[in-house]
């Protein structure tokens, strides 16, 4: 249907029970007036799942959809639903006259708009085929996990599925990593969820006969704050020859800003521990994680005095973690010595 002056479905009477979807091509700048139901009990108009306000340039008012002057952003799917129910009275798509591709239909190729996709009667409105798989409505998922929502359905003609997030059309274009829509599985998949993915996800399943919808509520749990985590096995026990260079590595993971120190255990008056039970240590290096190479302790031209226990100590606002390693320094003539060193520790 291509109109030249005003797109109008009149009169505003009881709707036809044949809910065939219509496509209307509208020229830019053209006024639109569509009616749905009787004026005094007209249905509510929705665009892409969002109800139109009774005022504004594009408005839904007393059963009428009115657009003062059609703009490219007005193209899309419009539904009129009967008051007090989800019965679809009108189901149509407005297409910009000079751009037939603006119908924004990237849906399942089996869409009922495909003229080659003719269906045998009787027609049947969409229905859920596995409602028991949809029972879990509320989802709380740790950040970084994958979420999959499914709305398996059937009907005749074969329905299409669209997804809304918080009532708005959802294609994932603003989501890092995007989304996967698997129409043959009636599913929406989001990988590596983040807090901004929280919301209400609605699957909207439609065919020419009717539509059904289902909401999933998603909460994303941020990682709980923790003291720094040190990669197991680092720093590693190391054997070096006098005069060589040594690197001790400490890999620190922390959400909160960590502070890192490299310590060398020393002996004072023949003792390794003070009266308080803590070891005597010498601070060799201290910095925040964003300092360059703070996670590496470089020992140049090592001597026998450099042998001993070294500790990587990492702390943040939540707590401390440390792991230790032993450096064994061999005289140049005997590079075959190996040591059974104590295990690395990870404590509060």
């Amino acid at each position: 249907l291509e109109a030249s002056e005003e797109v109008e479905l009149e009169p505003c009477l009881a709707p036809s029970l044949e809910q065939q979807e219509q496509e209307l091509t509208v020229a830019l700048g053209q006024p639109v007036r569509l009616c749905c139901g009787r004026a005094e009990r007209g249905g509510h108009w929705y665009k892409e799942g969002s109800r139109l306000a009774p005022a504004g340039r594009v408005r839904g008012w007393r059963g009428r959809l009115e657009i003062a002057s059609f703009l490219p952003e007005d193209a899309g799917r419009y539904l009129c639903l009967a008051r007090g129910s989800m019965i679809v009275l009108q189901n149509l798509t407005l297409i910009t006259g000079d751009s037939l591709t603006s119908s924004n239909d990237d849906e399942d190729p089996k869409s009922h708009r495909d003229p080659s996709n003719r269906h045998s009667y009787p027609q049947q409105a969409p229905y859920w085929t596995h409602p028991q798989r949809m029972e879990k409505k509320l989802h709380a998922v740790p950040a970084g996990n994958t979420v999959k929502f499914r709305c398996p359905a059937a009907g005749n003609p074969t329905p299409t599925i669209r997804w809304l997030k918080d009532g708005q059309a959802f294609h994932g274009e603003n989501r890092i990593g995007g989304i996967r829509l698997r129409h043959q599985h009636w599913s929406l998949v989001m990988e590596s969820v983040v807090p901004s993915d929280r919301g209400t996800y609605t699957c909207l399943v439609e065919n020419a006969v009717g539509s059904i919808r289902y909401n999933y509520l998603l909460d994303v749990l941020e990682r709980s704050p923790h003291r720094p985590i040190l990669q197991a096995g680092l720093p590693a026990n190391t054997t070096a020859v006098v005069g060589s260079d040594v690197e001790l590595l400490c890999k620190v993971y922390s959400d909160a800003q960590p502070h890192i120190q490299w310590l060398k255990h020393i002996v004072i008056n023949g003792s390794s521990f003070g009266a308080d039970g803590f070891p005597y240590v010498q601070v060799l290096k201290t910095a925040d994680i964003n300092s360059s190479e703070v996670e590496v302790l470089y020992l140049r031209n090592v001597s026998a005095e450099d042998a001993g226990e070294y500790t990587c100590l990492a702390g943040n606002s939540i707590g401390l973690s440390y792991q230790s390693a032993w450096l064994t320094v061999l005289p140049e003539e005997d590079p075959t010595w190996t040591a059974a060193a104590p295990e690395a520790r990870y404590t509060d």
Epitope: K136, K137, A140, R198, G199, I212, L218
Partner: antibody, heavy 119, light 111 residues
């Protein structure tokens, strides 16, 4: 034993504010969706709001949207309902309820706290 | 006006059976499971039936639930005086502006 104990109700003038609390015990509070449900005197139950375990996901009934705020402090095992711009029709007993994580029903309810909005 | 429709009252004599209906639409009962809550006089609501027909521990087998299409029902057999209470059906609603909807409640009187 799961226990939910509401507090903070009372008499408030129209346009005033009130904050309800719900102290939870007997379960791992931080892993559950929670809700507020209210019941006007002599009337039926009306759902008010739901909050996710993180506190970052909330939904509200149209009748309170923009006026009420649901929140939680998982470190204190406490659910809150901040009620602003109160109206006479908000007069009700307010219940906090735990939502079952499997099939999303309200499996435990508190005893309720009465909020009266009157001049 | 409640979204789910229940009869305002029901009654029966001790030992009798009674059924309470709950009618909804495709966006609530049609797509979601139904739960029933019992509210004894002066008390908070208590879960009675969940997922259409399941009983929490501690709820007697005299209480049973069922669902068909966009309607549900609660059946109570062998009525006892302590069953006198208000009974509410509830379901999640996938309509455009709703989340959880309740029936208006049915006052059960044991004569």
């Amino acid at each position: 034993e799961v226990q939910l104990l509401e507090s903070g109700g009372g008499l408030v003038q129209p346009g005033g504010s009130l904050r309800l609390s719900c102290a939870a015990s007997g379960f791992t509070f931080s892993t559950y969706w929670m809700a507020w449900v209210r019941q006007a005197p002599g009337k039926g139950l009306e759902w008010v709001s739901v909050i996710g375990p993180s506190g970052g996901m909330t939904v509200y009934a149209d009748s309170v949207k923009g006026r009420f705020t649901i929140s939680r402090d998982n470190s204190k095992n406490t659910l809150y309902l901040q009620m602003n711009s109160l109206r006479a029709e908000d007069t009700a007993v307010y219940y906090c309820a735990r939502i079952n994580s499997g099939s999303s029903h309200f499996d435990y309810w508190g005893q309720g706290t009465l909020v009266t909005v009157s001049s | 006006q409640s979204v789910l429709t229940q009869p305002p009252s029901a009654s029966g004599t001790p030992g009798q059976g009674v059924t309470i209906s709950c009618s909804g639409s495709s966006s609530n009962i049609g797509s979601n499971s139904v739960n029933w809550y019992q509210q004894l006089p002066g008390a908070a609501p208590k879960l009675l039936i969940y997922s259409n027909n399941l009983r929490p521990s501690g709820v007697p087998a005299r209480f049973s639930g069922s669902k068909s299409g966009t309607s549900a029902s609660l059946a109570i057999s062998g009525l006892r005086s302590e069953d006198e209470a208000d009974y509410y059906c509830a379901a999640w609603d996938d309509g455009l502006d709703a989340y959880v909807v309740f029936g208006g409640g049915t006052k059960l009187t044991v004569l």
